[in-house]
C-alpha cells in the first residue's frame, strides 16, 4: 500500500538516465550544484521536484513508515545540495517496462540465462551496472554512492528484491559499543525459470561454506544451472558467487571477526522490486536514525588515532571514506586487523565500480 | 511472513484500566507506523488510533481521546494501548494492524468492560 | 469525519454468480493530487480482517483475480466475479484520504 519505494525507484530511474542511462553519479547529482550549473545539475533539479511530489502524494499512506521519513529528509538535504529552487519543472516519470531483457528481436534467442549476452543483444550495449558493499562497522556503500556508517543490530536487509534477498545480521563491536559488526549473511537466489532452483547461501564468521545451505555448488538440475556458481580462492576467508543469469557476482569475504558482503549487480535486476518490499540499504542506505557520525567513535583499547591513521594510511594512501571507515573501526575495535576490511572492500569497489570516477568517496562529516 | 498478535484483552469494570500488547513478527517492526482498531460485538470496524514508526506522532480517534493511549518498544517488537476509564461501550475485540493504513492484522483480543 | 454508506448490508449470493457491493462517501475522497485512497477489506466468520483491495483497484498480494474495484469521487464499487464458499462474510469499504480514517458499515454476504 506505502508505495514509497516507487517513487524512490523511479528517482533513480530518472537519475540515471542523466548519464546517458550509467550507473553513476545517481543520487551525488554528479557535480555542479547550482540551478542549471555543472553535469546535469539542472535535470537533477527537476528529478528530486519529481522525487518530493511523488513522496507527497504517498503521504497518506506512508507518513508514519520509517521509509517515507527516510525520502523526505534525503529530498530536503539534496534539494539544500544542489541548490534546487522548490517550485519548476518536474520529470516526467521513467516508463514502467519489463525489469528484464525479454527475446523478440527476430534473431536467435539468446541464452535466456545469460544476462549480460541476452541485454546486449537486445539493446545493442552492455547493460549498466550497480556496485554496494558492507563491511567493518558495518558501512554500507549504496548503489548510489553514498556511504553511511551504521549502528544497524540485529537482522537488517542490504537488498530484497524480485530477484535476490541478502540480509545482514549486526551485533556490538565490543560491550558498551554504539558499532555493530556484520557476524552472519543470507543470501537468496530466487527461484527463475529455466536457469536456477531457489538457493539459499549463508555465512558466518568462522563458517565461510563454499556451497549453498542444500550443499550444491551451482544453480540445480534445470538447463541454466550452472548459471549459478560458487568458488573460493581463499577457503574460509573468501568466497565468490556468480549469477550471470541475473548479471551478478558476490563476494564474502572474513576478516578480523567480521563479515564482509560486495556486489556488482545489473541495473534492472537491482531495481526490479514493488512497494511490499521493504527498505534495503543498498538502496537507500543507512536509515537516518541508524547512522553514526564520526563524531560518535568511542575509542577502545590502546589504539590512539594517530596509530590508527598510519596503519591504515598503509594500504589507504587516499583519505576518502574507506580510510575514515578504516580508522573508525580500527579505534572502535582496537584491532589492526580491521585495516584488512576497508582495504579490501575498496578493491571490490575497483573491480566492480564500472565509473572509476567515483572510486574514492569523500565524507561530508 | 507477518505476525502480530494481540494479548491483555479480559474482564474490566468501568472507570478502570487494561493495558493490551501487540507482538510483532516477521517484518522490521522499527520502520513501520501501526494501528489500533476495535469491533464491538454483531458490529462494524472502528479505528482507534496509530502510531507512527518511531513515535514521534500519535493520532487518536476523538472517541477515545485523552483516555487510551499508544506506544510501542521497538526493542520488543511490541505495540500497546493503554486504555484508562474504560467504559461500557469501550466492550470490543481489539485489532492491531501494520502500515500507516493497515494491510496486516492479527488475531484479536476480547475487551469487556462490565460490572 | 466522512461518513462511509454501504449497500446493500446483506448480500445473499449463487455459488459461481457475481456479486457487487455499494460504497458511498459523504464527501469526494480524491486528493488534490488526484489520488483517491479507498480500501476494501473482508473479514471471514470468525477472523480478522483482510486487506483484498486499495486505493481503489489495486489487488493487495494474494488476493484472487475475482475481486476487482472501481469507482472515483464519492461513489464506489466492489465486484466479486463468481462467488465462492470462501468467500462468504463481511465486506467493509474503509478512506484514507481524510483524517480521521472511517469504515463503511459493512455487508454481508452469504450464499443463497
Known amino acids: 500500500q506505502c508505495k514509497i519505494l516507487r517513487c524512490n525507484a523511479e528517482y533513480v530511474s530518472s537519475t540515471l538516465s542523466l548519464r546517458g542511462g550509467g550507473s553513476s553519479g545517481a543520487l551525488r547529482g554528479g557535480g555542479g550544484g547550482g540551478r542549471g550549473g555543472g553535469v546535469g545539475s539542472g535535470g537533477l533539479c527537476r528529478a528530486l521536484r519529481s522525487y518530493a511530489l511523488c513522496t507527497r502524494r504517498t503521504a497518506r499512506t506512508c507518513r508514519g513508515d520509517l521509509a517515507f521519513h527516510s525520502a523526505v529528509h534525503g529530498i530536503e538535504d539534496l534539494m539544500i545540495q544542489h541548490n534546487c529552487s522548490r517550485q519548476g519543472p518536474t520529470a516526467p516519470p521513467p516508463p514502467r517496462g519489463p525489469a528484464l531483457p525479454g527475446a523478440g528481436s527476430g534473431l536467435p534467442a539468446p541464452d535466456p540465462c545469460d544476462y549480460e549476452g541476452r541485454f546486449s543483444r537486445l539493446h545493442g550495449r552492455p547493460p549498466g551496472f550497480l556496485h554496494c558493499a558492507s563491511f567493518g562497522d558495518p558501512h554500507v556503500r549504496s548503489f548510489h554512492h553514498h556511504f553511511h556508517t551504521c549502528r544497524v543490530q540485529g537482522a537488517w536487509p542490504l537488498l530484497d528484491n524480485d530477484f535476490l534477498f541478502v540480509q545482514a545480521t549486526s551485533s556490538p563491536m565490543a560491550l558498551g559499543a554504539n558499532a555493530t559488526a556484520t557476524r552472519k549473511l543470507t543470501i537468496i537466489f530466487k527461484n527463475m525459470q529455466e536457469c536456477i532452483d531457489q538457493k539459499v547461501y549463508q555465512a558466518e564468521v568462522d563458517n565461510l561454506p563454499v556451497a549453498f545451505e542444500d550443499g550444491s555448488i551451482n544453480g540445480g538440475d534445470r538447463p541454466g544451472g550452472s548459471s549459478l556458481s560458487i568458488q573460493t580462492a581463499n577457503p574460509g576467508n573468501h568466497v565468490e558467487i556468480q549469477a550471470a543469469y541475473i548479471g551478478t557476482t558476490i563476494i564474502i569475504r572474513q576478516t578480523a571477526g567480521q563479515l564482509s558482503f560486495s556486489i556488482k549487480v545489473a541495473e534492472d535486476v537491482a531495481m526490479a522490486f514493488s512497494a511490499e518490499q521493504d527498505l534495503q540499504l543498498c538502496v537507500g542506505g543507512c536509515p537516518p536514525s541508524q547512522r553514526l557520525s564520526r563524531s560518535e567513535r568511542n575509542r577502545r583499547g590502546a589504539i590512539t588515532i594517530d596509530t590508527a591513521r598510519r596503519l591504515c594510511k598503509e594500504g589507504l594512501p587516499v583519505e576518502d571514506a574507506y580510510f575514515h571507515s578504516c580508522v573508525f573501526d580500527v579505534l572502535i575495535s582496537g584491532d589492526p586487523n580491521f585495516t584488512v576490511a576497508a582495504q579490501a572492500a575498496l578493491e571490490d569497489a575497483r573491480a566492480f565500480l564500472p565509473d572509476l570516477e567515483k572510486l574514492h568517496l569523500f565524507p561530508s562529516d | 511472513e507477518v505476525q502480530l498478535v494481540e494479548s491483555g484483552g479480559g474482564l474490566v469494570q468501568p472507570g478502570g484500566s487494561l493495558r493490551l500488547s501487540c507482538a510483532a513478527s516477521?517484518?522490521?517492526?522499527?520502520?513501520?507506523?501501526m494501528n489500533w482498531i476495535r469491533q464491538a460485538p454483531g458490529k462494524g470496524l472502528e479505528w482507534i488510533g496509530m502510531?507512527?514508526?518511531?513515535?514521534?506522532?500519535?493520532h487518536y480517534a476523538d472517541s477515545v481521546k485523552g483516555r487510551f493511549t499508544i506506544s510501542r518498544d521497538n526493542s520488543k517488537n511490541t505495540l500497546y494501548l493503554q486504555m484508562n476509564s474504560l467504559r461500557a461501550e469501550d466492550t470490543a475485540v481489539y485489532y492491531c494492524?501494520?502500515?500507516?493504513?493497515?494491510?496486516?492484522w492479527g488475531q484479536g483480543t476480547m475487551v469487556t468492560v462490565s460490572s | 469525519d466522512v461518513v462511509l454508506t454501504q449497500s446493500p448490508l446483506s448480500l445473499p449470493v449463487t455459488l459461481g454468480q457475481p456479486a457487487s457491493i455499494s460504497c458511498r462517501s459523504s464527501?469526494?475522497?480524491?486528493?488534490?493530487?488526484?489520488?483517491?485512497?479507498l480500501e476494501w477489506f473482508q473479514q471471514r466468520p470468525g477472523q480478522s480482517p483482510r486487506l483484498l483491495i486499495y486505493?481503489?483497484?489495486n489487488r493487495f498480494s494474494g488476493v484472487p483475480d475475482r475481486f476487482s474495484g472501481s469507482g472515483s469521487g464519492t461513489d464506489f464499487t466492489l465486484k466479486i466475479s463468481r462467488v465462492e464458499a470462501e468467500d462468504v462474510g463481511v465486506y467493509y469499504c474503509?478512506?484514507?484520504?481524510?483524517?480521521?480514517?472511517?469504515f463503511g458499515q459493512g455487508t454481508k454476504l452469504e450464499i443463497k
Open positions: 494492524a501494520k502500515g500507516t493504513t493497515p494491510d496486516y
Open positions: 516477521g517484518f522490521t517492526f522499527s520502520n513501520y507506523g
Open positions: 502510531i507512527y514508526y518511531d513515535s514521534s506522532e500519535k
Open positions: 464527501q469526494s475522497l480524491e486528493t488534490s493530487d488526484g489520488d483517491t485512497f
Open positions: 486505493e481503489v483497484s
Open positions: 474503509f478512506q484514507v484520504t481524510h483524517d480521521p480514517v472511517t
